[in-house]
């Protein structure tokens, strides 16, 4: 049977917590990604940003999980209007910001 959306979001939160807690060296060698608008379409926007990071095993599971939340196909180089114009941040900061936002969505019961 399909995993309930609440459980899938909890899994994603757990993975982001693990990434932030287990981080020793700079995450993804300090790679920079586009900052995104967290107010709407967060899963696809986050995937569009993170998919441009290659060769970073630490976020591969996160990329797969976000893919499960995003209803359309996302490929590298693709950017929606949800990206914050011309603002790049380190992957580590991106993950922290995303985690805070997703935890709030979970606490509010907003799983879709």
């Amino acid at each position: 049977s399909p995993v309930p959306r609440s459980t899938a979001l909890k899994e994603l939160i757990e993975e982001l917590v693990n990434i932030t807690q287990n981080q020793k060296a700079p995450l993804c060698n300090g790679s920079m990604v586009w900052s995104i608008n967290l107010t709407a379409g967060v899963y696809c926007a986050a995937l569009e940003s993170l998919i441009n990071v290659s060769g970073c095993s630490a976020i591969e599971k996160t990329q797969r999980m976000l893919n499960g939340f995003c209803p359309h196909k996302v490929s590298a180089g693709q950017f929606s209007s949800l990206r914050v114009r011309d603002t790049k941040i380190e992957v580590a900061q991106f993950v922290k910001d995303l985690l805070v936002h997703l935890k709030k969505l979970f606490r509010e019961g907003r799983f879709n």
Partner: antibody, heavy 123, light 107 residues
């Protein structure tokens, strides 16, 4: 030391609104990751979760009672208030408040409980 | 809502016995399972959270295990002060739900 103390009317008439207050000691609901739950227990029966409020005012309710419940907080008094409208004798129970702390994963584990306040609904 | 089913509803054991209480969830709760002890006339107390983590001050004779939908609370050597009703609770997501309780008595 973390302590929670419930206060309530003891006796309420059917159709009235029950107002319960939980006063928090040893921690503040203005601190990130803190939450407070209300749980009730009818005499001789099990535990039923009612509502939850987080430090940032995010609230969740038991769907079976949502239309009758309101949870709120007064950070300046370090209190959480629960209101239950249109009470009925089946609402007779001991009402507990309890603390939840959520650091890292969101656990929803109630680590400290108040002593409870017995509320009887009767005319 | 996630339903929690506890068994047995009551049990009687001798001092020093190993006691196990089971809890089953209606769906996978990913180890977000908590156990509480309630003595007569008192408020519940947290014993174990996240399946197996002991709350501060809880004796080491209490332990928890399980995964997916099935969880167990074990008292390795029952003591007279362990007479109480024990409740499991899923902490995955609201509405938070409790098992029906297991009353533990001494033979």
């Amino acid at each position: 030391e973390v302590t929670l103390r419930e206060s309530g009317p003891g006796l309420v008439k059917p159709t009235q609104t029950l107002t319960l207050t939980c006063t928090l000691y040893g921690f503040s609901l203005s601190t990130s990751d803190m939450g407070v739950d209300w749980i009730r227990q009818p005499p001789g029966k099990g535990l039923e979760w009612l509502a939850h409020i987080w430090w940032d005012d995010v609230k969740r309710y038991n769907p079976a009672l949502k239309s009758r419940l309101t949870i709120s907080k007064d950070t300046s008094k370090n209190q959480v208030v629960l209101k239950l409208t249109s009470v009925d004798p089946v609402d007779t129970a001991t009402y507990y408040c309890a603390r939840t702390v959520s650091s890292g994963y969101i656990y929803y584990a109630m680590d400290y409980w108040g002593q409870g306040t017995l509320v009887t609904v009767s005319s | 809502d996630i339903q929690m089913t506890q068994s047995p509803s009551s049990l009687s054991a001798s001092v020093g016995d190993r006691v196990t209480i089971s809890c089953r969830a209606s769906q996978d709760i990913r180890n977000y399972l908590n156990w509480y002890q309630q003595k007569p006339g008192k408020a519940p107390k947290l014993l174990i959270f996240y399946t197996s983590k002991l709350h501060s001050g809880v004796p080491s004779r209490f332990s928890g295990s399980g995964s997916g939908t099935d969880y167990t609370l074990t008292i390795s050597s029952l003591q007279p002060e362990d007479i109480a009703t024990y409740y499991c609770q899923q902490g995955l997501t609201p509405p938070l739900t409790f098992g029906g309780g297991t009353k533990v008595e001494i033979k």
